[in-house]
Amino acid sequence: MAVTACQGLGFVVSLIGIAGIIAATCMDQWSTQDLYNNPVTAVFNYQGLWRSCVRESSGFTECRGYFTLLGLPAMLQAVRALMIVGIVLGAIGLLVSIFALKCIRIGSMEDSAKANMTLTSGIMFIVSGLCAIAGVSVFANMLVTNFWMSTANMYTGMGGMVQTVQTRYTFGAALFVGWVAGGLTLIGGVMMCIACRGLAPEETNYKAVSYHASGHSVAYKPGGFKASTGFGSNTKNKKIYDGGARTEDEVQSYPSKHDYV
């Protein structure tokens, strides 16, 4: 039961995280005009990965796409790439994890296959989350650098008479969405990896032994002890089968014909 819950929760958390990464990537407010010196402005600027916007006091908003590819800063291109890689990996991870979910039956898919798929999707989610966090952090670092640079040359002009106020930019909402979403995707990926451990059938040499006691039908399944311990070599009445380590819910979900004697 715990494995199913962990896997399901991991999937849901990752789904929310990837939706957040997509939202952050599409958002226009990666950087917003710093209003520290002028808290009330008639023209408000904000920028995203794909376009920059200006919202006027009148309510009119004008957005212009970055129609050049070569003219853009390398850092911006890198951030775009990281976010897109994060989305692509996350989307593939989601697709894989859907088929890996324990609650979904697809043909006669082995538990080992589901475990592998869960692990694969978990790793994809982790990388996806890291890509998003890295992308957002690179952009944030770029903003901080530019902020202090523009603060240094805040006012330029002739004889201090005419002032050209340079617009400074600070963290926009998309950065926080990106960080949270990346973190959620990362957590979801870790949960999937944890769930995978519970799903994977361990390769052991353990033997489960069924004894026929006189008068009663008793099934004995050793849990974690070596099958040979204390039971010598009396093999007359015993049925021997490979008893791979299984989780509690697997025992409940898939009753074996050897469970009852």
Epitope: N38, V40, A42, V43, S57, S58, R64, V162, V165, T167
Partner: antibody, heavy 118, light 113 residues
């Protein structure tokens, strides 16, 4: 078409208050910001402040802050400007105007003349 | 506050001639976000409210004759009337529409020579 209709001329005593109204029609009232501008006879234009009818946000010129209060009534599509502690310096024509693209005031009413006299 | 200075304060003209009037701001009105200058020009005739002519320093309002042209960037702006008509005799105001408080220039009065 877009129209702004202001109340009639006002005569007030020094120290009194006046409340000017500006009724908008021909558009959705909450869509555009309304500005108020003062013009003394034979002089230039002076911005008083603006109100965003949708949320009620107001911005004032420091000179008029505290004496002018801008409000908007969405149900009647009317903007109001209340002016307190009137002096002879407040005798002027007051315009309301709609702010549009470029933060430009592109529709103006005919103006309301306020005369402060004892 | 941004101070707007218009010159000349009075401009005598004759019909058909080209006139230019100047407007200077104490701060740049150029917005880096969209590379637009937030300067507006209005025309006011006696007994009438002002009429919008030009916004974003050079964009003509619909219905405004194309003899009116706005130009300039940053802190220096110009309004040009290519061929003055009798109906153009009025006071012209420039306005900072970039920052609160919106401030107007003192006006340039276009009068018959």
């Amino acid at each position: 078409q877009v129209q702004l209709q202001q109340s009639g001329a006002e005569l007030a005593r020094p120290g009194a208050s006046v409340k000017l109204s500006c009724k908008a029609s021909g558009y959705t009232f909450t869509s555009y910001v309304i500005n108020w501008v003062k013009q003394k006879t034979g002089q230039g234009l002076e911005w008083i402040g603006e109100i965003h009818p949708r949320g009620g946000n107001t911005y004032y010129s420091e000179k008029f802050r505290g004496r002018a209060t801008l409000t908007a009534d969405k149900s009647s599509s009317t903007a109001y400007m209340e002016f307190r502690s009137l002096t002879s310096e407040d005798s002027a024509v007051y315009f309301c105007a709609i702010l549009r693209r470029g933060n430009a005031m592109d529709y103006w009413d005919q103006g309301t003349a306020v005369t402060v006299s004892s | 506050d941004i101070v707007m200075t218009q010159s000349p304060s009075s401009l005598p003209v004759t019909a058909g001639e080209m006139v230019t009037m100047s407007c200077k701001s104490s701060q740049s009105l150029l917005n880096s976000g969209n590379q637009r200058n937030y300067l507006t020009w209005y025309q006011q005739k006696p007994g009438q409210p002002p009429k919008l002519l030009i916004y974003w320093a050079s964009t003509r309002e619909s219905g405004v004759p194309d003899r009116f042209t706005g130009s300039g960037s940053g802190t220096d702006f110009t309004l040009t009337i290519s061929s003055v008509q009798a109906e153009d005799l009025a006071v012209y105001y420039c306005q900072n529409s970039y920052n609160y408080p919106y401030t107007f220039g003192g006006g340039t009065k276009l009068e018959r020579k």
